[in-house]
């Protein structure tokens, strides 16, 4: 039994890191393998992650971690019984994929303005709380070409757009994702989408 693709890990910079790897053949990850991990820290203890299958030869492990700080470094040991298959390390701050924003809501009752709000996925004491920026994706269910992205580069988790920038009388969907420039993170997954019917009063045309 050998590792074909070494484990690669990403952290949510809060409490979970996800490691994925591939074996050289079909493997029952949960019965044959264990991923041991330990924070390099005087007061830490070793933990064991039981991997799950991720395709025939692929394995994935969800590591429960202490609250992350930038200096953290974890040792990783992949075992098959008594055989050490791979040894490595992982710095969560260097491989961050933020959590997806939640509670996306579209407020349509503000005088021909659409107000989209969502929740920051981090608690206020987490470093990323004040460092997330967002991308909001709005698209029409009727017209696949009517697809747009709004970059929200300020910290407030909200976006205002004029309802008239979208077509009236049709349904739209929106979703939002996050990233943090400070740690050069990847984008988060998209939030669940929310749907609304766009309608607004056409301005009276004067000739």
């Amino acid at each position: 039994m050998k590792v074909l693709q070494e484990p690669t890990c990403v952290s949510d910079y809060m409490s979970i890191s996800t490691c994925e790897w591939k074996m050289n053949g079909p493997t029952n990850c949960s019965t044959e393998l264990r991923l041991l991990y330990q924070l390099v820290f005087l007061l830490s203890e070793a933990h064991t992650c039981i991997p799950e299958n991720n395709g025939g030869a692929g394995c994935v492990c969800h590591l429960l971690m202490d609250d992350v700080v930038s200096a953290d470094n974890y040792t990783l040991d992949l075992w098959a019984g008594q055989q050490l298959l791979w040894k490595g390390s992982f710095k969560p701050s260097e491989h961050v994929k933020p959590r997806a924003p939640g509670n996306l809501t579209v407020h349509t009752n503000v005088s021909d303005t659409l107000l989209l709000t969502w929740s920051n996925p981090y608690p206020p004491d987490n470093y990323l709380y004040n460092h997330l920026t967002y991308a909001v994706n709005i698209w029409s269910e009727n017209d696949p070409a009517d697809f747009r992205i709004y970059n929200v580069t300020y910290l407030e988790p909200s976006l205002r757009i004029a309802a008239s920038t979208l077509k009236s009388g049709i349904s739209y969907r929106a979703r939002v994702r996050a990233w943090a420039q400070c740690y050069n993170t990847t984008w988060s997954e998209w939030s669940p989408s929310t749907k609304w019917h766009n309608s607004y009063r056409e301005p009276f045309e004067q000739h």
């Epitope: 409490s15 820290f41 005087l42 007061l43 830490s44 609250d67 930038s70 608690p123 206020p124």
Partner: antibody, heavy 115, light 109 residues
């Protein structure tokens, strides 16, 4: 808002015992190492003890064998049991949350050791 | 045990002046594990700098940290009235644990 609220300080005779408490709120207590740091009157800061999320502990040589740090994650609380207290243990004791450094501190509680 | 020695013991300066505080370690310290704190009378310490040079949340940019190995510096570019306090450096070591310097008092001249 992160808060660390301390209690349990007071006057104790040399050789006596005292238990300090620190209640945490505004963060996930169980995922954080916790510490005690003290400051004798007019002196500098001295690290006393720390406890990891899994219960691993460490102590300064000056208190080893006399002080015991513990935590109750269900109550979001940190404790310091101090036995065989000496005059040199008299200080303001702070609880702190952190790891390699201490971003969050309690308000401090005074322990007076005097006959 | 790693010993941190701060100098000077007291720094007498006027508001608006630049303050340079030194912290020297008895053996090499990882920059990732070097921090600076400010403490005012009757108050708990406040984290200013971590990782030798990163400002903690809410700390004004007049505070900066630098250094590596055994020599570290905290600089206050222009002293404000509220900056007069005692400053401590602190290090963490995987075997020796946590130690503080003895402190530098920044007082009004």
């Amino acid at each position: 808002e992160v808060q660390l609220v301390q209690s349990g300080g007071g006057l104790v005779h040399p050789g006596g015992s005292l238990r300090l408490s620190c209640a945490g709120s505004g963060f996930t207590f169980s995922r954080n190492a916790m510490f005690w740091v003290r400051q004798a009157p007019g002196k500098g800061l001295e690290w006393v003890s720390g406890i990891g999320t899994g219960g691993a502990t460490s102590y300064a040589d000056s208190v080893k064998g006399r002080f015991t740090i513990s935590r109750d994650n269900a109550k979001n609380s940190l404790y310091l049991q101090m036995n065989s207290l000496r005059a040199e243990d008299m200080a303001v004791y702070y609880c702190a949350r952190g790891r390699y450094y201490f971003p969050w501190w309690g308000q401090g509680t005074l322990v007076t050791v005097s006959s | 045990e790693i010993v941190l020695t701060q100098s000077p013991g007291t720094l007498s300066l006027s508001p608006g002046e630049r303050a340079t505080l030194s912290c020297r370690a008895s053996q090499s310290v990882s920059s990732s594990y070097l921090a600076w704190y400010q403490q005012k009378p009757g108050q708990a310490p406040r984290l200013l700098i971590y990782g030798a040079s990163s400002r903690a949340t809410g700390i004004p940019d007049r505070f900066s940290g630098s250094g590596s190995g055994t020599d570290f510096t905290l600089t206050i570019s222009r002293l404000e009235p509220e900056d007069f306090a005692v400053y401590y450096c602190q290090q963490y070591d995987h075997s020796a644990g946590w130690t503080f310097g003895q402190g530098t008092k920044v007082e009004i001249k």
